[in-house]
């Protein structure tokens, strides 16, 4: 499955929106920094299968959508930017949905994919628990925004690699 060029553009637009959503200086939140353990190995271009990567992308975007569509999130960010962000994520989910289904039909996920999906899910569990532990403070949201930007940047680069391999 070839991810459309629009998907890459959508990913870049989502990154730009995430950057624009920043409200407070990252430097004022250094004490709140946390290593969420982004599951880089899941997206490792040397050993991943394409279907695995696409399933993991989908899970990542779905979890990002859920994370940013909570009441606590709505209170933390500019509503207009948040709505635009939702639209970009929704479009990416649509692109990836078609790909996930095309890669292996709607058959059961292979063992390798199971582990990659679980790794992404656990990553977002750590983010969720961090936010709850910090009582959804502005600095906690800023740390999470920066983290999601990093993970999106990583997956954007990998998707370029995916298209080159095709």
């Amino acid at each position: 499955c070839d991810l459309p060029q629009t998907h890459s553009l959508g990913n870049r637009r989502a990154l730009i929106l995430l950057a624009q959503m920043g409200r407070i200086s990252h430097f004022s939140c250094l004490k709140d920094r946390y290593d969420f353990g982004f599951p880089q190995e899941v997206f490792d271009g040397n050993q991943f299968q394409k279907a695995q990567a696409i399933s993991a992308f989908h899970e990542m975007i779905q979890q990002t959508f859920n994370l940013f569509s909570t009441k606590d999130s709505s209170a933390a960010w500019d509503e207009t930017l948040l709505d635009k962000f939702y639209i970009e994520l929704f479009q990416q989910l649509n692109d990836l949905e078609a790909c996930v289904t095309q890669e292996v039909g709607v058959e059961e996920i292979a063992l390798m994919n199971e582990d990659s999906i679980l790794a992404v899910r656990k990553y977002f569990q750590r983010i969720t628990l961090y936010l709850m532990g910090k009582k959804y403070s502005p600095c906690a949201w800023e740390v999470v925004r920066a983290e999601i930007m990093r993970s999106f940047s990583f997956s954007t680069n990998l998707q370029k690699g995916l298209r080159r391999k095709d």
């Epitope: 990836l96 996930v100 289904t101 709607v106 996920i109 656990k122 969720t128």
Partner: antibody, heavy 119, light 108 residues
Framework: QVQLVQSGAEVKKPGASVKVSCKAS????????MHWVRQAPGQGLEWMGE????????IYNENFKSRVTMTRDTSTSTVYMELSSLRSEDTAVYYC????????????WGQGTLVTVSS | EIVLTQSPATLSLSPGERATLSCSAG???????LYWYQQKPGQAPRLLIY???NLASGIPARFSGSGSGTDFTLTISSLEPEDFAVYYC?????????FGQGTKLEIK
């Protein structure tokens, strides 16, 4: 509010198949994986597998892999769990439970569907 | 498969007493993915505690959870009549997700 409503009780003969439905409401159906858990009479809970309603992909417990099929219908926000080659040991209450993260993991359950397998 | 073993199988106590329920995992479980559920006859399970020690919404403070690695505990500080039920620990640290066989908390 989140609601999961399951289909009614079923009585099946050994060797037959059963298809249980779970209709979701109160949230974006395609955003959360749906799980199936069963409970034999007087027994504990057993995880059967999960389906992502967004693209329909499934992850099954090896114990059920050859006999279970999970599907979804996004137009009606409904997931289905079909179990084939039924035997008496499959007599159980079957639950759907919504995935999520943190306090949302299995925070919402269907009311359960009793499937009785008897000759 | 991570096997979760709960003990005791049945615990007979009186209202007002303290209940301690154990859950032992066959291999290490990250505390973030260890949950506890309560089930009453004819009802679906109800989430009590998530990520080992966090109280789910609407759950009274008499319930608490602790533990790490392979040993986890659910404690009810002072039993109320409505607490008599079956309790299950559950892990989603690795596939297949598993539940303990349950501890039945009954009135003495």
């Amino acid at each position: 509010q989140v609601q999961l409503v399951q289909s009614g009780a079923e009585v099946k003969k050994p060797g037959a198949s059963v298809k249980v439905s779970c209709k979701a409401s109160g949230y974006t159906f395609t955003n959360y994986w749906m799980h199936w858990v069963r409970q034999a009479p007087g027994q504990g809970l057993e995880w059967m597998g999960e389906i992502n309603p967004s693209h329909g992909r499934t992850i099954y417990n090896e114990n059920f892999k050859s006999r279970v099929t999970m599907t979804r219908d996004t137009s009606t926000s409904t997931v289905y769990m079909e179990l084939s080659s039924l035997r008496s040991e499959d007599t159980a209450v079957y639950y759907c439970a919504r995935g999520g993260l943190g306090p949302a993991w299995f925070a919402y359950w269907g009311q359960g569907t009793l499937v009785t397998v008897s000759s | 498969e991570i096997v979760l073993t709960q003990s005791p199988a049945t615990l007979s106590l009186s209202p007002g007493e303290r209940a301690t329920l154990s859950c032992s995992a066959g291999s290490s479980v990250d505390s973030s993915y260890l949950y506890w559920y309560q089930q009453k006859p004819g009802q679906a399970p109800r989430l009590l505690i998530y990520s080992t020690s966090n109280l789910a919404s609407g759950i009274p403070a008499r319930f608490s959870g602790s533990g790490s690695g392979t040993d986890f505990t659910l404690t009810i500080s002072s039993l109320e009549p409505e607490d008599f039920a079956v309790y299950y620990c559950h892990q989603w640290s690795s596939y297949p997700f598993t539940f303990g066989q349950g501890t039945k908390l009954e009135i003495k």
